[in-house]
Interface confidence: low
Amino acid sequence: EDLKKVFPPKVAVFEPSEAEISHTQKATLVCLATGFYPDHVELSWWVNGKEVHSGVSTDPQPLKEQPALEDSRYSLSSRLRVSATFWHNPRNHFRCQVQFYGLSEDDEWTEDRDKPITQKISAEAWGRADC
Amino acid sequence: PYIQNPDPAVYQLRGSKSNDTSVCLFTDFDSVMNVSQSKDSDVHITDKTVLDMRSMDFKSNGAVAWSNKSDFACTSAFKDSVIPADTFFPSPESSC
C-alpha cells in the first residue's frame, strides 16, 4: 500500500426519521464513515458510554466510492435501531465510533515508524425530547 | 432470515446543518427483495443487511443510500430496485 496516500474517514450520524418513528414506533440511526483509504476500519456503536451490539447492523465490508478506480476511497455504513421511547429520552446519548488504522492528515510519516497510529473518530447524537 | 411482518419503507434521514450528505434508509422489506446498486456513480447504495433487535425479538432487513448531490431524492435512490410506490415516506420539514 502507498503509505503516503492515507485518508481518515469522515464520520457522521444521521438521526431517525420522524416518519419512521410514527409509523413503526422504532427509530433507526445511521452512521456513515466516508472517504477513507485504505479500507481498515472498525465501527462500533456506544449508547450512554457502553458499546452495544443488539439492534446494530453494519456493512460486512466497506464500499468502494468509485468502483472503477483501483485506489478508490471507501465508505462504510451502519444502522442502530432502538425503540421510539428510547430515542425520545433526551438523556440517552448515541455515539458511532470508527477506529481507523492509519494516519490523521496532520500526522507526519517517517519510514521507520513500525506500526500505524490507531485513530478513533466518532460522531454523536442525543435523544430528542423535542426540537 | 424470515421477516415476520414485512412493512417496506424508505425514509429520509437528517444529518447536521453542516453536512451536505443526504441519506435514505430502505427498511423492513421482505428477504426475497434484492437491493440493486446504483448506476449513478455519485449515489452509493449498500447491500442489504439484517438487524436484530434482540430485546424486542424483532429482525429487519435494511439498506442505505446516500449522496452529496444536491438533487438527490429518496424517491429515486432505489429506482433500480423493485419497490412499491407507497413505500416512500416524505420527511416533513422540520420546524426546529
Epitope: A12, P90, R91, H93, W126, R128 | S16, K17, N19
Partner: nanobody, 117 residues
Amino acid sequence: DVQLVESGGGVVQPGGSLRLSCVASGYVHKINFYGWYRQAPGKEREKVAHISIGDQTDYADSAKGRFTISRDESKNTVYLQMNSLRPEDTAAYYCRALSRIWPYDYWGQGTLVTVSS
C-alpha cells in the same frame, strides 16, 4: 448557532483555587452536554469534566477530587471550580457544548490558567 464565552482564568499559586465560567448564548435550548477541556503548551487538548442536562458528571482522573463541574440553567452558565491547583494544571481551558445531533459541536475561545509560585 451557539456562542460560548469563558472567563475566570488567571494566575494563582499552587494550592490555590479558581472558578471558571462558561456562558452560552444562542440556541441554548438545543444543548444537552457541556464539557471543560484544557490544552497545555505543546500538548494535546484533553477532557477535564463533562456535565449532561441530567446533571450527570464525569471527570478526568487528574480532576477527580479537586475539580467540580456544575451548571446554572437559569443563567445558561457552566462552572468549573478548581481547588488544590498544581503547576501541571497550567493550560488554556476551553468550554464545549454539544447539541442533540452531532456535529452541532461548539467551543469557546478559551481562558488561560497559570499555576505558579
